[in-house]
């Protein structure tokens, strides 16, 4: 006999189910975006669901397959790149990840005119980076840390550099620290607009200390991974920039671009390169103490075959209250006159805004202004400037796209996205075709993401590119948590927070609270974006309230908040999380005996310090791959915010801000410490030192390591990680399994 409890309501609510951990780990509710691979003003390429590479012409409405899935499959290609003259396609296979952006791969060149792979003078393998010239079908590639050039795919290569050496000299690709903390790319070479010149960086890591860690693998003996990795205060890579004429590469060879004198006088970084014309290039440099940046515009001297960077074309950007720029120093977007440019930097009120620079930075014309921030300049045409900001309705965690008509006076501003799908879409990015003839808008939420195509002149929507219909249908019977974004005003500081509430949330009841924290300088956690993830599950199924708080040091709310943490990491970020928790308790629906905090990376550092704050607020917490001392982290990142770990600079705060210094304070909390042993970014050393300090202090704690896993803890480790953390939290909150 099967006894069925009677259904009280046969309503829709009863047919709906909560999220499960399995849903999250399987990626059941992941979404798709559509970024056209633009190849002209009105054409783009896209890889179809069945893996054909299809060319779409917006104006004719026609589309055709330029590369079949059969050809892709013949070499197991996972990526492709069409040459600008449309004669060849490179096919990328044997993808092998290195660091965050870098990977090696095997490349095959397919000739579209005869439908065959190019034979003879094949590319070596594995290649570290490969790209077409912007015009025609020249190829530049990096192999074994040296740069090679091919005039045509079938031609023999011309070797540009010869000094490349593993872990010593890097040509055309960045070393570890430049890749992760400065360029945020896998490449360090740049073609001029018409392919006449090729600029590249050479990084000399000869004197950099090496981080060495074991990679256990399956062999009898573990391998040792060695990475030149400058930690705070250590010797840094030495960088040089060269430019070679690709038409006559052997004529004068690579010519070095001079470094501005005020930069070269002490340790410095190269931060970015922007080509303006074929004979004008813009380089950005940064002092090692990262509050002074110099933008240098250099011209080709035909008579000497050299690059000249006159002092009159050096523009200095300096911060007196923090570091230069936001996370990175912004890059210029040049005007059609090929000398003046638009750039985002702090205005006199301490908000990042678009400025127009012609002769000097002092004479810059401010284009946007207000108590909000311009975030990205997408495109400048003869009559329009497209940018994103968080101006609309004063929500810092939104992103809308704006157009300023700069072809007339006074320039008029129009929000392109603010009212398109107001409830569904409040966080956009955009992708523009040549001359901004058309553009794609990609909306990330707060509703289900949607990608649309628009006319660049009228802003009219032409078509939906991706609307995630399957996801929408799949979510119809899911009890998703409720989300709200609000702010707390505390001591002249605005703390924005996102609260994720259980589906049947009742303000009169008490709920366990989990704080999810990142909190790193120039980060933002409170964003109006769609996500169905682990914390969604914790709210939906386990009845937790989850909160994310953007405290001091976070971005897009002005320099006062951003630079508050300058030279003082680990203080205000933690204070603001604690302040927010106290405010949440005052709201009346939080069970103050069941409050936890968790974070990853910088968030692991903040969660550890919050647990060790001695406030008694937190019952338990988790730190995944935390930084434990700023002396252990990368120079470029750490020194930007902390200065140098020297007596005459900021050593005292380096020492005071470690997790180890607070080992005693972990005695009254449940602490779960997690780290991958092959973390190239935040080294396992960080957690090893926390564990050692806790053991030495005879403090009990829980720990989990993931063998041979990096900072991302991917693959099967992800499933294990979230399952483990779920058990830990449920135990902490006394929730039954």
């Amino acid at each position: 006999i099967v006894l069925r409890p009677p259904r009280v309501h046969n309503s829709e609510e009863n047919t709906m189910r909560a999220l499960t951990l399995k849903d999250i780990l399987n990626g059941t509710f992941s979404y798709k975006t559509f970024f056209p691979n633009w190849i002209s003003g009105q054409e783009y390429l896209h890889q179809s669901a069945d893996n054909n590479i299809v060319l779409y012409n917006i104006e004719t409405g026609q589309s055709y397959t330029i590369l079949s899935n059969r050809t892709m499959k013949s070499v197991n290609a996972s990526n492709y790149g069409l040459s600008p003259d449309r004669q060849f396609v490179y096919l990328e296979s044997d993808y092998s990840k290195l660091w965050r952006y870098s990977y090696t791969a095997t490349y095959y060149i397919y000739d579209l005119s005869n439908g065959e792979f190019v034979r003879g003078n094949e590319l070596p393998r594995p290649i570290q980076y490969l790209c077409w010239s912007p015009v025609g079908s020249k190829l530049a590639y990096v192999y074994q840390n040296n740069i090679y050039l091919k005039q045509r795919p079938g031609d023999p290569p011309f070797q540009i550099t010869f000094n490349g050496r593993e872990n010593k000299i890097f040509n055309g690709i960045p070393d570890w620290v430049y890749e992760e903390e400065m360029l945020a790319t896998k490449y360090a070479l740049w073609w001029s607009p018409n392919g006449k010149f090729l600029a590249y960086a050479e990084f000399n890591d000869t004197d950099i200390p090496v981080i060495a860690y074991s990679y256990y693998g399956d062999e009898q003996y573990p391998r040792t991974i060695n990475i030149p990795y400058p930690k705070a205060g250590a010797k840094n890579p030495f960088v040089r920039i060269f430019i070679i004429d690709t038409t006559y590469p052997a004529y004068v060879g690579p010519q070095e671009v001079p470094v501005p004198a005020m930069i070269a006088s002490s340790d410095y970084y190269f931060s970015w390169l922007t080509w303006v014309t074929d004979e004008r290039v813009c380089l950005q440099w940064l002092k090692r103490v990262q509050n002074v940046s110099v933008l240098s515009i250099c011209d080709f001297r035909e008579d000497w075959q050299t690059w000249d960077c006159p002092k009159t074309q050096e523009h200095i950007e300096e911060s007196r209250t923090g570091w230069a720029g936001g996370f990175f120093v912004s890059t210029p977007v040049f005007s059609y006159d090929a000398i003046s440019y638009y750039k985002i930097f702090s205005d006199k009120d301490g908000y990042k805004h678009i400025h127009y620079i012609k002769d000097t930075v002092e004479n810059a014309i401010q284009i946007t202004s207000g108590k909000w921030e311009a975030i990205n300049i997408f495109r400048v045409t003869q009559d329009s400037l497209f940018y994103s900001s968080n101006e609309f309705e004063d929500y810092p965690g939104r992103r809308n796209i704006y157009r300023i008509s700069i072809g007339s006076y006074p320039p008029s501003k129009k929000c392109v996205t603010c009212h398109l799908r107001k409830e569904r879409c409040q966080y956009y990015t955009a992708s523009f075709s040549d001359y901004a003839k058309y553009y794609a808008l990609v909306c990330y939420g707060p509703g289900i993401p949607i990608s649309t195509l628009h006319d660049g002149r009228t802003d009219q929507e032409i078509k939906i590119l991706e609307e995630n219909k399957e996801l929408e249908n799949a979510l119809k019977n899911i009890q998703l948590p409720k989300e709200e974004i609000k702010k707390l005003e505390v001591d002249e500081i605005t703390l924005w927070y996102k609260m994720i509430l259980p589906p049947q949330f009742d303000r009169s009841k008490k709920y366990p609270l989990l704080i999810q924290v990142y909190g790193g300088p120039c980060s933002q956690s409170v964003r109006s974006v769609f996500a169905v993830n682990w914390i969604s599950y914790l709210a939906s199924k386990e009845g937790m309230v989850i909160a994310l708080v953007d405290g001091r040091g976070t971005a897009f709310q002005g320099d006062k908040l951003l630079y508050a943490v300058y030279r003082k990491l680990g203080v205000y970020e933690v204070e603001d999380q604690i302040t927010a928790v106290r405010k949440f308790i005052e709201m009346g629906f939080i069970d103050e005996k069941r409050i936890a905090i968790w974070g990853w990376s910088y968030g692991g550092y903040v969660s550890s310090l919050a647990l060790a704050s001695g406030t008694g607020l937190f019952k338990c917490g988790i730190a995944v791959a935390p930084v434990s001392s700023w002396e252990y982290y990368a120079s470029v990142y750490t020194e930007r915010f902390m200065g140098l770990p020297t007596k005459d600079d900021n050593l005292e705060h380096y020492k005071n801000s470690t997790v180890m210094a607070r080992a005693e304070y972990f005695r009254n909390v449940d602490y779960l410490l997690i780290h991958g042993t092959a973390d190239d970014n935040v080294h396992f050393q960080n957690s090893a030192q926390i564990a050692k300090a806790l053991v030495n202090a005879q403090v009990d704690f829980q720990a989990m390591w993931y063998s041979d896993q990096n900072h991302g803890l991917s693959g099967l480790s992800t499933n294990h990680l979230y399952t483990h953390m779920t058990h830990f939290l449920k135990q902490c909150f006394s929730l039954s399994d």
């Epitope: 006159p310 014309i365 072809g407």
Partner: antibody, heavy 122, light 107 residues
């Protein structure tokens, strides 16, 4: 039809002050950058300074920065040049000029007044 | 402060001739240059801006050229109404100085 009409010139003693006006008509004055230029008898043109549409930016030639003040009243469609501490070398024909916005952020002097004469003499 | 050096200071030419006036800047002005014509007793008139763009209503016999620090104004097939003084002016950085002028007289 665009018109710029200067007035206020005349004889002034060394060390004295004078305020020149430039009345604009025939165009949207409040969206134009405006400039003052002078021409000493038998000599070339000398740029004095400029003012942007909302008066938030005023630029001067360095040698005149401390004695001349450029201002505008958009409600009255009028540009002003306040001259102080004048000397004999300030004797000149004073022109006001305005012009089109040229992308990017640059203004030419398309329209000129007929000028007003300032004579500095004791 | 950028200096503008104009040459020649004066020149005589006949109707129908072609003349070229040059202007040298003491620094790179990146094509931010205008040319003006001023007739005796009259206000200056804009001829060329952005170094080579003719202002509205200016006859096509006038043409501007140059880059960097060197610029020139060319008048093809001189007409009687072209005689007068010519001035260059840069718009690169304030102060926007003028050249000393070139007086073009009928031969």
């Amino acid at each position: 039809e665009v018109q710029l009409l200067e007035s206020g010139g005349g004889l002034v003693q060394p060390g004295g002050s004078l305020k020149l006006s430039c009345a604009a008509s025939g165009f949207d004055f409040s969206t134009y950058w405006m400039s003052w230029v002078r021409q000493a008898p038998g000599k070339g043109l000398e740029w004095i300074g400029e003012i942007n549409p909302d008066s938030s930016t005023v630029n001067y030639t360095p040698s005149l920065k401390d004695k001349f003040i450029i201002s505008r009243d958009n409600a009255k469609n009028t540009l002003y040049l306040q001259m102080t501490k004048v000397r004999s070398e300030d004797t000149a024909l004073y022109y006001c000029a305005g012009g089109y916005y040229r992308y990017p952020y640059y203004y030419t002097m398309d329209y000129w007044g007929q000028g007003t004469t300032v004579t500095v003499s004791s | 402060e950028l200096q503008m050096t104009q040459s020649p200071a004066s020149l005589s030419a006949s109707v129908g001739e072609t003349v070229t006036i040059t202007c040298r800047a003491s620094g790179n002005i990146h094509n931010y240059l205008a040319w003006y014509q001023q007739k005796q007793g009259k206000s200056p008139q804009l001829l060329v801006y952005n170094a080579k763009t003719l202002a509205d209503g200016v006859p096509s016999r006038f043409s501007g050229s140059g880059s960097g620090t060197q610029y020139s104004l060319k008048i093809n097939s001189l007409q009687p109404e072209d005689f007068g003084s010519y001035y260059c002016q840069h718009f690169w950085s304030t102060p926007y100085t003028f050249g000393g002028g070139t007086k073009l007289e009928i031969k």
